[in-house]
């Protein structure tokens, strides 16, 4: 079948990095500069992606593969193949329409991207709190108190008032 196909379609012999040039009796021609073909038998080469502005080149375009972009410092990729760059925030913040905003009390974000998430509720599993949450870190739960079996509630001690220079416990 492959032999028959190649007899019928000479373009199938054109390897990646070339295209089947109809203007030149279907001769395999190299892809022109700033273009590529990643598979054989192509009738055209694709234009290379250009990484401009907030995008920067992670991998240069070659005759057989497209360029790959990532984002300049202070931004991170979103979407398939880094189709967009979104502004970074600090840990303990999330990006809103008005820019980076601190996580509300009871929520945290331990990354430079994404949204603030609620602290784990240790008491839902009948567990104690070993380390209280902060804007940047989730709560750490610990063993169940002796006077409560797993599943019981009201084991999370109230968060102490913040002391200057420290996060709460």
């Amino acid at each position: 079948f492959e032999r028959t196909r190649s007899l019928q379609d000479p373009c199938s012999n054109c390897p990646a990095g070339t295209f089947c040039d109809n203007n030149r009796n279907q001769i395999c021609s190299p892809c022109p500069p700033n273009s590529f073909s990643s598979a054989g038998g192509q009738r055209t080469c694709d234009i290379c992606r250009q990484c401009k502005g907030v995008f920067r080149t992670r991998k240069e375009c070659s005759s057989t593969s497209n360029a790959e972009c990532d984002c300049t410092p202070g931004f991170h990729c979103l979407g398939a193949g880094c189709s967009m760059c979104e502004q970074d925030c600090k840990q303990g913040q999330e990006l809103t329409k008005k820019g980076c905003k601190d996580c509300c009390f009871g929520t945290f974000n331990d990354q430079k991207r994404g949204i603030c998430r609620p602290w784990t509720n240790c008491s839902l599993d009948g567990k104690s709190v070993l380390v209280n949450g902060t804007k940047e870190r989730d709560v750490v739960c610990g063993p169940s108190p002796a006077d409560l079996s797993p599943g019981a509630s009201s084991v999370t001690p109230p968060a102490p008032a913040r002391e200057p220079g420290h996060s709460p416990q």
Partner: antibody, heavy 122, light 107 residues
Framework: EVHLLESGGGLVQPGGSLRLSCAAS????????MGWVRQAPGKGLEWVSI????????YYADSVKGRFTISRDNSKNTLYLQMNSLRAEDTAVYYC???????????????WGQGTLVTVSS | DIQMTQSPSSLSASIGDRVAITCRAS??????LAWFQQKPGKAPKSLIY???SLQSGVPSKFSGSGSGTDFTLTISSLQPEDFATYYC?????????FGGGTKVEIK
């Protein structure tokens, strides 16, 4: 590298008091619960007490409840164990240990200090 | 209180042997179990947490398994440095409790 160094052990008479200290370095002290575990000569390990990262939560073994008090000074990266009304059965090596956690749950001890010997005898 | 029962209390084994130590909890503790190694005159060292997770820096010859009430620490090929006492610890609930220890000796 995490380093824990206990001090304050020694010989004390029954009914007496002693205060153990544990100087911590190599990690963000206030972000970790800390604990004390003891080991009587030739015996196994016995948990004594745990204190939460900010000092607000404390837990004790029944054998020491009402006599021992765990505390911490996060500004000095130091953990304490105040031991009152000491008894012969409190004789042991006392280890300070950082409480390990993975994700949002913890409660085991890693690492441990080298220990300090408390001997209660007349 | 949750009682932790280790068995055997001691065992003799040869270099290269596969060794298994068991720990049984008096009630279910999910996977809230740790294993420690202690050599004479030294502080305990954490080997395994969450029943089967290897502590950073611990060689892969140590492995842990189990959930609920029955747990096992396995040393795949015993080496001279592995002769020590091993303890389990539950951290499902207070009071935290340790097993009585298993002393691994040279045969």
């Amino acid at each position: 590298e995490v380093h824990l160094l206990e001090s304050g052990g020694g010989l004390v008479q029954p009914g007496g008091s002693l205060r153990l200290s544990c100087a911590a370095s190599g990690f963000t002290f206030s972000s970790y619960a800390m604990g004390w575990v003891r080991q009587a000569p030739g015996k196994g390990l016995e948990w004594v007490s745990i204190i939460g990262g900010g000092g607000g939560s404390t837990y004790y073994a029944d054998s020491v409840k009402g006599r021992f008090t765990i505390s911490r000074d996060n500004s000095k990266n130091t953990l304490y164990l105040q031991m009152n009304s000491l008894r012969a059965e409190d004789t042991a090596v006392y280890y300070c240990a950082k409480v390990g956690y993975s994700g949002t749950y913890g409660g085991w001890f890693d690492p441990w200090g080298q220990g300090t010997l408390v001997t209660v005898s007349s | 209180d949750i009682q932790m029962t280790q068995s055997p209390s001691s065992l003799s084994a040869s270099i290269g042997d596969r060794v298994a130590i068991t720990c049984r909890a008096s009630q279910g503790i999910s996977n809230y179990l740790a294993w420690f190694q202690q050599k004479p005159g030294k502080a305990p060292k954490s080997l395994i947490y969450a029943a089967s997770s290897l502590q950073s820096g611990v060689p892969s010859k140590f492995s842990g398994s189990g959930s609920g009430t029955d747990f096992t620490l396995t040393i795949s090929s015993l080496q001279p440095e592995d002769f020590a006492t091993y303890y389990c610890q539950q951290y499902n609930s207070y009071p935290l409790t340790f097993g009585g220890g298993t002393k691994v000796e040279i045969k």
